[in-house]
């Protein structure tokens, strides 16, 4: 593991006094009962508290809500309860934060049964001032803001109503009824599915996909025989029923619904789903769940079109019951994602790939590391990191992985090292590189956060006793300090730091227990003092991202360039800053066949990097041409990786072939190809095509 | 002390052929890929070659591609250009270069150089 | 390839004096590259890697800036000892390629 506190740790001098100085303590007049806690707008330093203590009597529930605000990143709060009337809020609405900096927050009260409609609080001063607005209708969901103007909203009704508000909240109108999803997209559009049947649940795969570009003067069909739809990058997908009413399959459309082409994968049953588990404006990682209860399936790559997909990864790990997924996009660095499979002997996996899906490997465990009792040969194993999958089975793992696009090639994790994911006690592991190369951080699990841009780790030992404890590291969690930060420990419930990892400062949140009563309690860290100076041009050095072989004159090369980035050295302590922007250096490299992904028709045999034309096509293959128009249906047998910037190099040019004759398909009747019947999908929730959970871009 | 020293330089004909060597000395000489520059009188310079620590990466100049073979030896410390089908512009001095031990990295260490004249 | 251009080719300098000496690539090349100075009759020797740092016993006079596709080479106060011919030298992408030098006279 890294050197403990004793061996060449001493970086921080006197950071005891410092840290002392820049600690602050806040007693919420709380009983305890839940707490969450939003930031409003980036760098202003503006948290909201919300506290809620709920009695559930049999007929209605009696509680409490106390607002508190802070505009100094947590070290002191106001009570501002009766800007809010004393009103109860419901939590399951949380607190809607606006867009951006837009300083807008909105706030669900809870009213009685018999009223008409419900009531929000809304403020668009950074939560100095809030306006009581009662609402013609009982939402259901949070409101939801526009990405373009925060000052449209769009909710749904208990009896399944579209709202849309202009005027942030103020007035409202309907303008659908029997909604049963809704999304805003690009542009101030909004896309929902509507029965007009009037049944959301009985009735998915006969919705309709509709779309307003007006706020709801006018509407679109834009597809039909819809079972659920989403939204990525630059994306619209739908998983529509087929002919005979058994089977879905996606289809997608780059022109919000304008057109659609059926995407070249395997149709799924009622007993299935499909889920995007990422997407950008330049392509998208679809997951298709396997038959029967397997609690797998297999990843796929689309191309830029979205239509023609690559296999990426088979038994990727996805519980068909929870809807668990292990599968995280690394961000702070290009390219990275790591998932689980489950392997043929039932035990769980990690695996990792470099470039963005094309390959998955094994994550090399730490250097100096021993292989655990899952282990088959004592020498040879792999670092096994816990995720989603490892939390919804009730493992002792308090937190996903952790990176930041800002703090380059950092990557933080729980984990174990063998040949698969262990039940045993994990510790805390940490890559500097992106998850090339890993080391053992800290022993036993721990809550981990990143502050100014990587320049500080600070962590808090997982324990069912109370801690006063907390670990901080300068070096990317090589060394580890610790600092006693209240004499009298509390029971933790959590770290909270400003999204976006820039901040200096730390909250650590618990709550105290005596006799009779146990209260909210907050620390609030800040580091500024430990970090004395600011950043200076030579406490960088060049890190050239992906290197794995220096003398290749390829190194790095990943989606056809390659990227040198400034970083901090480890030795320097200073402060990277709050304006801190990544210095990163892009270099076209050659192209080579690896750049190139198989067209529509063309595969590519196993250990050969070649694409060949398949002998005929046949199967779901066809589905893909259904809807195709010609230039859909001419191509070199190649097509560029979405995102590939190679130039020169391996330029492979095949015949032109017109793959129009091989196209015969009654997947469905030729008189259905219209943009109402070859649409989108939508849905209301539920197990199958989750388009929604944890960060999963869409899941049916 | 590091140190490069080339050899094998003279004057030949067009369409002979010559073999220059480079004895490293005061450095791991097996954990460094390694490099032919070359600068025509009173020219600028122009790289020629370059080979990896195991001899895995091989790349040459388009100039030279077909006609000279690099090649080294661990074991002797020593870095090896055959040149065949010289031709009147091949005609320079020749240096031996190590490339530091980083990706993209810069030519650390140089030799004295050798002249080769191509001439009838 | 790469063409890197360096300028001014030609540069009569009294001592004392601040030498800039700019190289331009034909595309982003990031930090890759090099500075070498070859004096004459003599082979070259490296001043400045990775288009900013100093390589062990060059004297502090020389410095380095820039990244992506243009960059410099400065020296600070010159001395009689630095007239020599100044190469730039890519290693970003193959062929490797050097600029066509910059000769530094001592007035």
């Known amino acids: 593991s890294a050197p403990g506190e004793d061996e060449e740790c001493g970086r921080v001098r006197d950071f005891v006094a410092k840290l002392a100085n820049n600690t602050h303590q806040h007693v919420f007049d709380d009983l305890r009962g839940s707490v969450s806690l939003s930031w409003v707008g980036d760098s202003t330093g503006v948290i909201l508290v919300l506290t809620t203590f709920h009695v559930p009597l049999v007929i209605m529930t009696f509680g409490q809500s106390k607002l508190y605000r802070s505009e100094d990143y947590g070290k002191n709060f106001k009570d501002i309860t009766d800007l809010i009337n004393n009103t109860f809020i419901r939590t399951e609405f949380g607190m809607a934060i606006g867009p951006e900096n837009s300083g807008k927050v909105v706030l669900t009260a809870e009213v009685s049964g018999g009223s008409r409609g419900g009531r929000i609080f809304r403020s668009s001063d950074f939560a100095k001032n809030f306006v009581q607005t009662d609402l013609p209708f009982h939402p259901l969901t949070q409101m939801m803001y526009s990405p373009q103007n925060s000052d449209y909203l769009l909710a749904l009704s208990t009896e399944n109503g579209l709202w849309v508000s202009k005027n942030f909240g103020g007035k409202w109108e309907e303008i659908h009824k029997t909604v049963c999803l809704a999304k805003w997209g690009r542009k101030g559009t909004i896309f929902f599915t509507a029965n007009h049947n009037g049944s959301c649940s009985n009735d998915r795969g006969m919705l309709e996909l509709e779309r307003t570009t007006d706020y709801g003067k006018s509407f679109k069909t834009v597809a039909s025989k819809i079972y659920s739809f989403g939204l990525g990058g630059k994306f619209l997908f739908a998983s529509v029923m087929t002919g005979k009413g058994t089977l879905r399959a996606i289809h997608v459309s780059v022109d919000d619904g304008d057109t659609w082409n059926m995407a070249q994968l395997p149709p799924v049953g009622h007993e299935q789903f499909y889920s995007i588990l990422a997407a950008n404006d330049e392509m998208v990682f679809m997951h298709v769940d396997e038959p029967g209860d397997s609690g797998f399936g297999t990843i796929y790559v689309s191309d830029d079109r979205g239509t023609v997909y690559s296999k990426s990864l088979e038994r990727h790990l996805y519980t068909t019951t929870g809807g668990e997924t292990d599968f995280i996009n690394v961000t702070s660095l290009r390219g990275v994602f790591t998932t689980s499979i489950l392997a043929e002997d039932k035990s769980v996996q990690s695996v990792i790939s470099f470039d963005q899906g094309g390959e998955w490997v094994p994550l090399r465990k730490p250097a100096d590391s021993k292989c655990d009792a899952t282990a088959r040969d004592p020498e040879k194993c792999s670092l096994h990191i816990h995720a989603a999958y490892s939390i919804a089975t009730g493992l002792n793992v308090p937190m996903l992985p952790l990176s930041e696009p800002n703090a380059v090639g950092l990557v933080l994790a729980h984990g174990s090292v063998g040949d698969a994911i262990s039940v045993m006690r994990p510790d805390v592991y940490v890559s500097d590189d992106g998850g090339y190369t890993w080391i053992k951080a800290l022993e036993g699990p721990h809550y981990y956060t990143i502050l100014d841009s990587g320049g500080i780790i600070v962590a808090i030992e997982h324990s069912s006793r109370p801690i006063n404890v907390i670990k901080f590291s300068t070096d990317e969690g090589q060394c580890w300090q610790t600092y006693t930060f209240t004499r009298d420990p509390i029971y933790f419930t959590g770290l909270a730091s400003e999204p976006g990892a820039r901040s200096m400062n730390i909250s650590i949140w618990g709550f105290t227990e005596s006799f009779l009563t146990s209260q909210w309690v907050s620390y609030t860290i800040d580091f500024k003092d430990i970090l004395e100076r600011n950043c200076e041009e030579k406490d960088y050095t060049i890190w050239l991202a992906h290197s794995t072989d220096p003398e290749d004159y390829e190194d790095g090369c990943i989606l056809g360039y390659k990227e040198q980035f400034l970083r901090l050295r480890k030795s320097s302590v200073c402060q990277n800053g709050r304006d801190y922007v990544v210095t990163k250096q892009p270099s076209i490299c050659l192209c080579s066949l690896e750049d190139f992904l198989c067209d529509f028709g063309y595969y590519r045999p196993e250990n050969d990097s070649k694409c060949v034309e398949q002998p005929e096509l046949k199967g779901h293959d066809l589905e893909f041409c259904l809807y195709g128009r010609e230039e859909h249906l001419t191509t070199n047998g190649y097509r560029k990786i979405p995102g590939d910037k190679c130039q020169g190099g391996v330029n492979p040019v095949r015949e032109v072939k017109d793959l129009k004759k091989k196209c015969t398909s009654n997947f469905l009747s030729p008189e259905k190809q219209n943009s109402k019947s070859n649409g989108s999908a939508g849905g209301s929730g539920g197990l199958n095509d989750i388009f929604e959970a944890q960060k999963i871009e869409w899941h049916e | 002390e590091v140190q490069l020293v080339e050899s094998g330089g003279g004057l030949v004909k067009p369409g002979g052929s010559l073999r220059l060597s480079c004895a490293a000395s005061?450095?791991?000489?097996?954990?460094?890929?390694m490099n032919w520059v070359r600068q025509a009188p009173g020219k600028g310079l122009e790289w020629v070659s370059s080979?990896?620590?195991?001899?895995?990466?091989?790349y040459y100049a388009d100039s030279v591609k077909g006609r000279f073979t690099i090649s080294r030896d661990n074991a002797k410390n020593s870095l090896y250009l055959q040149m065949n089908s010289l031709r009147a512009e091949d005609t320079a001095v020749y240096y031996c270069?190590?490339?530091?031990?980083?990706?993209?990295?810069?030519?650390?260490?140089w030799g004295q150089g050798t002249m080769v004249t191509v001439s009838s | 390839e790469i063409v890197l251009t360096q300028s001014p080719d030609f540069q009569s300098v009294t001592p004392k004096e601040k030498v800039t000496i700019t190289c331009r690539a034909s595309?982003?090349?990031?930090?890759?590259l090099h500075w070498y100075q070859q004096k004459p009759d003599q082979s070259p020797k490296l001043l400045i890697k990775y288009a900013s740092q100093s390589f062990s016993g060059v004297p502090s006079r020389f410095s380095g800036s820039g990244s992506g596709t243009d960059f410099t080479l400065t020296i600070n106060s010159l001395e009689a000892e630095d007239a020599a011919a100044y190469y730039c030298h890519q290693s970003s992408s193959l062929p490797l390629t050097f600029g066509g030098g910059t000769k530094v006279e001592i007035k």
């Open positions: 005061g450095f791991t000489f097996s954990s460094y890929s």
């Open positions: 080979i990896s620590s195991s001899s895995s990466y091989i």
């Open positions: 595309q982003s090349i990031g930090y890759s």
């Open positions: 270069a190590r490339r530091g031990s980083g990706s993209y990295d810069a030519f650390d260490i």
